[in-house]
């Protein structure tokens, strides 16, 4: 067991051109805070994957207001360290994500607003108990300077916090076979409970007599470094001579991940993907709960009030992400129906509807014909958000108010002549054609193509189109 400690030294514009504007202003004062997320191993993981080693939020920094016209300086920082406790052995290799958040203190609807300013990530090797390691990371135009270390919590000592120390029972020396605990020379190693010969640097045990290896080490006593370059299979146990992993039982056999964690094999060992609210190599440690205030942007934390349960953030409209940290482009979900225009006003979503549609999402098709009269015996037809009149013969236009010239469209085929008639139009067909629109040729034997001429009409007579 132990604690990972992170000390932020400065956060401000990086060197070079294109200095960022200050995130705060006289109109919008703000303050910073930081979040650190730790994961075991050197895996390149997405920012959203669980912080299996743990996570921590800093306190809020002092309120800062930009001086008009001044370049963005290093911004005032929160006091104190970010501390991430770990219950298991320190893995030696780890990945980190450090996020810089801005809390806007203007007159925000619903309380302060949070936004992510910068996120840096890295993969490091670190022995517990060592000195502070200094680091500089850049995210866009911002630069973050920080130091970190891992320290063991008594009675644990060693580079992995797996050796146990106890106060000396005698003032001058430790008991038989027990060494002084460097650097705590006034303490002694506790009696060994691991398997005899288990490497004190690279092995640890949770049960008497066992010897479990830290990442990168193998063998019954964890004394053989893993070399994957000449190995055929990523499974143990190890061949003591080459250090290669040879086929054997899989590290995920029996699922070592607690609390519903899912196990995945890695080239050297296994990794647990923990459900929200749990962390540790085997998901055995409960992590962030509602008491840590993990929900940003007005999100409500649901569940997790007791230390052993996970939390869920119910995000207000316009935000998403496991911590409500991401602003949603709500219009990208195309909520406005029937071709409505979407407007995201921040506090609400609005749809500007096309003619003929109404409702919050333009979901209501208005009765296009309501109150619309079609003149001269025309009938109203709904459709597409606009009314349309189907006009009686001899009339046209949007409302059937225009007297139509039925011959304007040249309706008579094959050279037939068109005559306007009070009830429509009449086609006088050219020789050899018949039909209402002169569309049918008359066959040489006198028989016409379908349809037959109506009784009382000879081919070539004018055909009245009623």
């Amino acid at each position: 067991a132990g604690v990972f400690e992170l000390q932020i030294h400065s956060f401000g514009p990086g060197p070079g051109p294109g200095a960022p504007r200050s995130p705060c202003s006289a109109r919008l004062p703000c303050r910073l805070f930081f979040r650190v997320c730790l994961k075991p191993g050197l895996s390149e993981e997405a920012a959203e994957s669980p912080c299996a080693l743990g996570a921590a939020l800093s306190a809020r920094g002092p309120v800062y207001t930009e001086q008009p016209g001044a370049p963005a300086p290093d911004l005032p920082l929160p006091d104190g360290l970010l501390q991430v406790p770990f219950r298991d052995a320190w893995p030696g290799t780890f990945s980190f994500i450090i996020e810089t958040w801005r809390e806007e203190l203007g007159d925000q609807i619903g309380g302060p607003a949070w936004s992510l300013l910068a996120r840096v990530a890295g993969r490091r090797r670190l022995a517990a108990g060592g000195p502070w390691a200094r680091d500089i990371q850049r995210a866009g135009a911002w630069e973050l300077r920080f130091s970190y270390r891992a320290r063991c919590e008594p009675p644990a000592v060693g580079t992995a916090c797996t050796r146990l120390c106890r106060p000396r029972s005698a003032p001058s020396r430790c008991g038989p076979g027990l060494r002084p605990c460097a650097p705590l020379e006034d303490e002694c190693e506790a009696p060994l409970v691991c398997r005899a010969g288990c490497s004190p640097e690279h092995g640890f045990c949770e049960q008497p007599g066992e010897c479990r290896c830290l990442e990168g080490w193998t063998g019954p006593l964890c004394t053989v470094p893993v070399s994957t370059s000449s190995c055929l299979s990523p499974r143990g146990p190890s061949s003591a001579t080459t250090g290669c992993l040879v086929p054997g039982p899989g590290p995920c056999d029996g699922n070592p991940c607690a609390n519903g964690g899912s196990c995945s094999e890695t080239p050297r060992s296994f990794e647990c993907t923990c459900p929200r609210g749990f962390y540790g190599l085997r998901c055995e440690v409960s992590g962030v709960t509602c008491a840590d205030g993990p929900c940003f942007n007005g999100g409500l934390c649901v569940g997790g009030a007791d230390p052993d349960s996970a939390y869920i953030c119910h995000c207000p409209p316009g935000f998403q992400g496991s911590n409500c940290e991401k602003r949603v482009d709500r219009c990208s979900l195309q909520p406005c129906r029937n071709g409505g225009l979407c407007l995201d006003l921040g506090h609400a979503l609005r749809c500007r509807c096309r003619a003929g549609f109404a409702g919050p999402r333009c979901e209501h098709d208005l009765d296009d014909c309501a109150g619309r009269a079609c003149a001269n015996g025309g009938t109203c037809v709904e459709g597409g958000g606009a009314h349309r009149c189907s006009c009686a013969l001899g009339f046209g236009g949007r409302d059937c108010r225009e007297r139509a010239d039925p011959c304007a469209a040249r309706p008579c085929a094959h050279g037939g002549r068109c005559y306007a008639h009070f009830s429509g139009l009449v086609c006088a067909c050219a020789p050899g054609y018949m039909g209402a629109r002169c569309e049918f040729p008359v066959h040489p034997d006198g028989a016409s193509a379908l349809p037959a001429a109506p009784p009382g009409l000879r081919p070539g007579d004018p055909q009245r189109y009623l």
Epitope: G110, G111, P112, A113, A291, G293, C295, V302, A348
Partner: antibody
Framework: QVQLQESGPGLVKPSETLSLTCTVS????????WTWIRQPPGKGLEWIGY???????NSNPSLKSRVTVSLDTSKSQFSLNLSSVTAADTAVYYC????????????WGQGTMVTVSS | EIVLTQSPGTLSLSPGERATLSCRAS???????LAWYQQKPGQAPRLLIY???SRATGIPDRFSGSGSGTDFTLTISRLEPEDFAAYYC?????????FGGGTKVEIK
């Protein structure tokens, strides 16, 4: 101007289900979370539960097994069902709109008194 | 759940005086997600303050909120006749959403 109006029976028999509806006018029901709160006579306020058009709901654990909150976007209404009522459920029931940047309640209905009695 | 305790239960003051109402949480409210409401007899509550210190739309500036963590305060700088009512605090940091028991501000 957003307005909320509660409706439902004012008298419910013990062991029956209390059913109330809140009609929202003046804004889209899809833009906000919507909630129910109650206040027994002469006492303080108690949150019952909320709903969002996406289907997200949450309710007070002290009532959870008895509470159902639902929403009908087409009618711009949301509803409360509280089953197995007793005299202790007698209260003024309020519907309210949830703030868009935090779960405070910025617009309230005028409230409806529900008495549980045989 | 977070239990909110309001004090005093009743505050007897005269118009023009300063009123200070307290709301104490049983555990830390992480994000200053605390609201204050005013309720007059026979009416629904009205939101006064959100985010511990921001006034809601249309609320006079004699109402102010402060505090963080577990201790929050609503101050009415000069009581007007219409301010005599019951006042409730509510936290919206962690579910279940909870209200305080209320403080009644009455005319002395």
């Amino acid at each position: 101007q957003v307005q909320l109006q509660e409706s439902g029976p004012g008298l419910v028999k013990p062991s029956e289900t209390l059913s109330l509806t809140c009609t929202v006018s003046g804004d889209s029901i899809s833009n906000y979370y919507w909630t129910w709160i109650r206040q027994p006579p002469g006492k303080g306020l108690e949150w019952i539960g909320y709903i969002y058009y996406s289907g997200t709901t949450n309710s007070n654990p002290s009532l959870k097994s008895r509470v159902t909150v639902s929403l009908d976007t087409s009618k711009s209404q949301f509803s409360l069902n509280l089953s197995s009522v007793t005299a202790a459920d007698t209260a003024v029931y309020y519907c309210a709109r949830v703030f868009n940047r935090g779960f405070a309640f910025d617009i309230w209905g005028q409230g409806t008194m529900v008495t549980v009695s045989s | 759940e977070i239990v909110l305790t309001q004090s005093p239960g009743t505050l007897s003051l005269s118009p023009g005086e300063r009123a200070t109402l307290s709301c104490r949480a049983s555990q830390r409210i992480s994000n200053t997600y605390l609201a204050w409401y005013q309720q007059k007899p026979g009416q629904a509550p009205r939101l006064l303050i959100y985010g511990a210190s921001s006034r809601a739309t249309g609320i006079p500036d004699r109402f102010s909120g402060s505090g963080s963590g577990t201790d929050f305060t609503l101050t009415i700088s000069r009581l007007e006749p219409e301010d005599f009512a019951a006042y409730y605090c509510q936290q919206y940091d962690t579910s279940p959403l909870t209200f305080g028991g209320g403080t009644k501000v009455e005319i002395k």
